[in-house]
């Protein structure tokens, strides 16, 4: 159920409407919940979840990551730089979320919900951003060839890729949420 459509919302029609920040917070937590559900299926299917973070780090995926220079951490916090990084990062994750679409059997709808909810989150954040020109959109041709390459991997690598995407996306969203709370 997307944020704002749960039974509690229906039962409380006179509640104050959510602020922009509250909607973003709720949206991110909704996506995080979806990621958890997908990871349960991944972990039940393979032993990737037991692999150490260091072992998994030795991959050639260029997944978006927060760094000090992005202005999202306590040191050198910069609201506008950080917001641009969050939106850019989410746009870069979209190709990886597309890759996930055919990776789940029992959680197919959940994978779709994570993808669609991320698109909604990007829209929320773009409304918040003052400097939309600074946001670089990934090249569709590059994304298409990356998708083809990922889908051509053997089963073990596909399992690892799925696990890495989900874990990295979770960490990116958590860092984003903490930073957005300060804006």
């Amino acid at each position: 159920v997307p944020p704002g459509e749960d039974s509690k919302d229906v039962a409380a029609p006179h509640r104050q409407p959510l602020t922009s920040s509250e909607r973003i917070d709720k949206q991110i937590r909704y996506i995080l919940d979806g990621i958890s559900a997908l990871r349960k299926e991944t972990c039940n299917k393979s032993n990737m979840c037991e692999s150490s973070k260091e072992a998994l780090a030795e991959n050639n995926l260029n997944l978006p990551k927060m760094a000090e220079k992005d202005g999202c951490f306590q040191s050198g916090f910069n609201e506008e730089t950080c917001l641009v990084k969050i939106i850019t990062g989410l746009l870069e994750f979209e190709v990886y979320l597309e890759y996930l679409q055919n990776r789940f059997e029992s959680s197919e709808e959940q994978a779709r919900a994570v993808q669609m909810s991320t698109k909604v989150l990007i829209q929320f954040l773009q409304k918040k951003a003052k400097n939309l020109d600074a946001i670089t959109t990934p090249d569709p041709t590059t994304n298409a060839s990356l998708l083809t390459k990922l889908q051509a991997q053997n089963q073990w690598l596909q399992d690892m890729t799925t696990h890495l995407i989900l874990r990295s996306f979770k960490e990116f969203l958590q860092s984003s949420l903490r930073a957005l709370r300060q804006m």
Epitope: Q74, G76, E171, R178
Partner: antibody
Framework: EVQLQESGPGLVKPSQTLSLTCTVS??????????WSWIRQPPGKGLEWMGV???????YYSPSLKSRTSISWDTSKNQFSLQLSSVTPEDTAVYYC??????????????WGQGTQVTVSS | QSALTQPPLVSGTPGQTVTISCAGA?????????VSWYQQLPGTAPKLLIY???TRASGIPSRFSGSKSGNTASLTISGLQSEDEADYYC??????????FGRGTHLTVLG
């Protein structure tokens, strides 16, 4: 009421691996956004955060202990464990397990175990 | 990772107001509102007093309050009572899901 209980050997020899378990009752360790930390306190000193395992089973460690620390869980027993390798007498401390009720934006510990004394000595 | 800086000792008389400070680098306390405070009585586990800088934990009296200014967080105890004599620790979030504690402050209630 959530309760945490540490267990493990009170005496460990230098260079060996210290292993402790925290048994949680009154709530599931996989509950959304909860995280479970290990925190220690050497005799007469302050608290030191060692590491955490979150609701998805992801682990994060103190940079100063990262190379020696491993945290894992057994969801069927509602337990999480700490392993600290290559111990020295400086690892002598009271070891606490604690719960963070919201690892996404919380970062505080509302429930603690009573602590277990571990002495490193030959 | 270096601990947050707290004064080792603070003292006061019953009824007085005391403040314990907790100073960190800007990647500890600086921007984020994730400071918590704990009370530890001798031989017992720490007990949560304050979280998210100013929010009192369940069952904690209003005599205990938290605040933050720049890179320093503070715990204020008003109407000091003899049972407040204990060690007090601050803690803060560090980047990448890490946490750090202060070195601790022993509060003595005189007289």
């Amino acid at each position: 009421e959530v309760q945490l209980q540490e267990s493990g050997p009170g005496l460990v020899k230098p260079s060996q691996t210290l292993s402790l378990t925290c048994t949680v009752s009154g709530g599931s360790i996989t509950t959304r956004y909860y995280a479970w930390s290990w925190i220690r306190q050497p005799p007469g000193k302050g608290l030191e955060w060692m590491g955490v395992i979150d609701y998805d089973g992801d682990t994060y460690y103190s940079p100063s202990l990262k190379s020696r620390t491993s945290i894992s869980w057994d969801t069927s027993k509602n337990q999480f464990s700490l392993q600290l390798s290559s111990v020295t007498p400086e690892d002598t401390a009271v070891y606490y397990c604690a719960r963070d009720p919201d690892v996404v934006t919380g970062f505080h510990y509302d429930y603690w175990g009573q602590g277990t004394q571990v002495t490193v000595s030959s | 990772q270096s601990a947050l800086t707290q004064p080792p000792l603070v003292s006061g008389t019953p009824g007085q107001t005391v403040t314990i400070s907790c100073a960190g680098a800007n990647n500890d306390i600086g921007t984020y509102a994730y400071v918590s405070w704990y009370q530890q009585l001798p031989g017992t586990a720490p007990k949560l007093l304050i979280y998210k800088v100013t929010t009192r934990a369940s069952g904690i009296p209003s005599r205990f309050s938290g605040s933050k200014s720049g890179n320093t967080a503070s715990l204020t105890i008003s109407g000091l009572q003899s049972e407040d004599e204990a060690d007090y620790y601050c803690a803060s979030y560090r980047n990448f899901n890490n946490a750090v504690f202060g070195r601790g402050t022993h509060l003595t209630v005189l007289g």
